[in-house]
């Protein structure tokens, strides 16, 4: 058992069927000695007598609010959460595994530059009694700060009969270096309640695996004299990092007809500028990634050929 | 919100078999970790059984144990209950409730209720 928090709990069961539980000794936080009770959650009844009460925690129905009274009047309170772990594996109940980009990806990390802020969210179909908190640091054995503030929901979706909720937070390494080289990963770690069950969620990553440039900005067409092509130009998207002749970008250009079926053309360049032809109904997208490293493409561009 | 409706109850002799059911509808079913309530006249609810959202792990009451199988079709949006070997004492409004905290055999771990069923055994 171990405290989460002030008068929260936290007991650790290795569940199966017929498994004996965990013995728990809850203490009144009260100087007094005689006449104390212990009761469960909403119920009047009576658990046990004394200033400790010993308990067999086997299941959720043995966690809760347990407090102790003296005379009517409430003496102190502790609330017992369970973490699971079933067949050696602890519960991941609360997140929805997003599968992305591999099995067992419950947290996704994105950041739009070097700085050292970066963004995480997670799904769940959870909509009540139910809260997060989230810490980060920089290594494990001598970590190094990063803040992150509380975790907010992002978006609601409805995908069949199921409405799915979005939840982000926001981090900022405290001491961030844009242009070195990042040799200990960025540690996330979120802790999830619903209602008496806790769960936690790691994630580790370097901040230049989950650079995601935002689409590039002032994407325009200029039309050439006397010919169907058009020289089309950009800018680097205001949150990239600066300077850009260190922190460069490259662009993948596409024409993409009316028609999904229809042949993509596309142009890769380290400019912000490029030529192609304009077919009719067609548009022109543009992305960029980090030019010298192989993290994500940003979202495209886009603006149509007429 | 989930509704759950309870059926297969009915008056049998003592030593044989029931299988109950309960339907929902509402919301992904998947989702949640089911159980099992019964309730004899004059007395108060008691915990029979419960299943987990993948149907991996069942956690069944020790007054049931050996006798009482719950099991669910996720495919379907059912869950059963198979009772076997009944005894007069089994006799009650059999109630199936939704959840998401396995293993639980407190009520107040459940959110949505079915109506129930009522089972007789006579000996």
């Known amino acids: 058992i171990w405290e989460l928090k002030k008068d929260v709990y936290v007991v650790e069961l290795d569940w199966y069927p017929d498994a004996p539980g965990e013995m728990v000794v809850l203490t009144c936080d009260t100087p007094e000695e005689d006449g104390i009770t212990w009761t469960l959650d909403q119920s009047s009844e009576v658990l046990g007598s004394g200033k400790t009460l010993t308990i067999q925690v086997k299941e959720f129905g043995d966690a809760g609010q347990y407090t102790c009274h003296k005379g009517g009047e409430v003496l102190s309170h502790s609330l017992l959460l369970l973490h699971k772990k079933e067949d050696g594996i602890w519960s991941t109940d609360i997140l929805k595994d997003q599968k992305e980009p591999k099995n067992k990806t419950f947290l996704r990390c994105e950041a739009k530059n070097y700085s050292g802020r970066f963004t995480c969210w997670w799904l769940t179909t959870i909509s009540t009694d139910l809260t997060f908190s989230v810490k980060s640091s920089r290594g494990s054995s001598d970590p190094q700060g990063v803040t992150c503030g509380a975790a907010t929901l992002s978006a609601e979706r409805v995908r069949g009969d199921n409405k799915e909720y979005e939840y982000s937070v926001e981090c900022q390494e405290d001491s961030a270096c844009p242009a070195a080289e990042e040799s200990l990963p960025i540690e996330v770690m979120v802790d999830a309640v619903h209602k008496l069950k806790y769960e936690n969620y790691t994630s580790s990553f370097f901040i230049r695996d989950i650079i995601k440039p935002d689409p590039p900005k002032n994407l325009q067409l200029k039309p050439l004299k006397n010919s169907r092509q058009v020289e089309v130009s950009w800018e680097y998207p205001d949150t990239w990092s600066t300077p850009h002749s260190y922190f460069s970008l490259t662009f993948c250009v596409q024409v993409q007809g009316k028609s999904k079926r229809e042949k993509k053309d596309r142009v890769f360049t380290d400019k912000t500028s490029a030529t192609v032809i304009c077919r009719k109904n067609a548009s022109i997208s543009v992305r960029a990634q980090d030019r010298y490293y192989s993290s994500s493409w940003s979202e495209w561009a886009s603006v149509p050929c007429s | 919100e989930v509704q759950l409706v309870e059926s297969g109850g009915g008056l049998v002799q003592a030593g044989v078999s029931l299988r109950l059911s309960c339907a929902a509808s509402g919301r992904a079913f998947s989702n949640f970790d089911m159980g099992w309530f019964r309730q004899a006249p004059g007395r108060e609810r008691e915990f029979v059984a419960a299943i987990n959202r993948s149907g991996s792990s069942t956690y069944v009451s020790a007054s049931v144990k050996g006798r009482f199988t719950i099991s669910r079709d996720n495919a379907k949006n059912t869950m059963s209950l198979q009772m076997n070997n009944l005894k007069p004492e089994d006799t009650a409004v059999y109630v199936c409730?939704?959840?998401?905290?396995?293993?639980?055999?407190?009520?107040?771990?459940?959110?949505?209720w079915g109506q129930g069923t009522q089972v007789t055994v006579s000996s």
């Open positions: 409730a939704t959840g998401l905290l396995f293993p639980s055999s407190a009520e107040r771990n459940y959110d949505y």
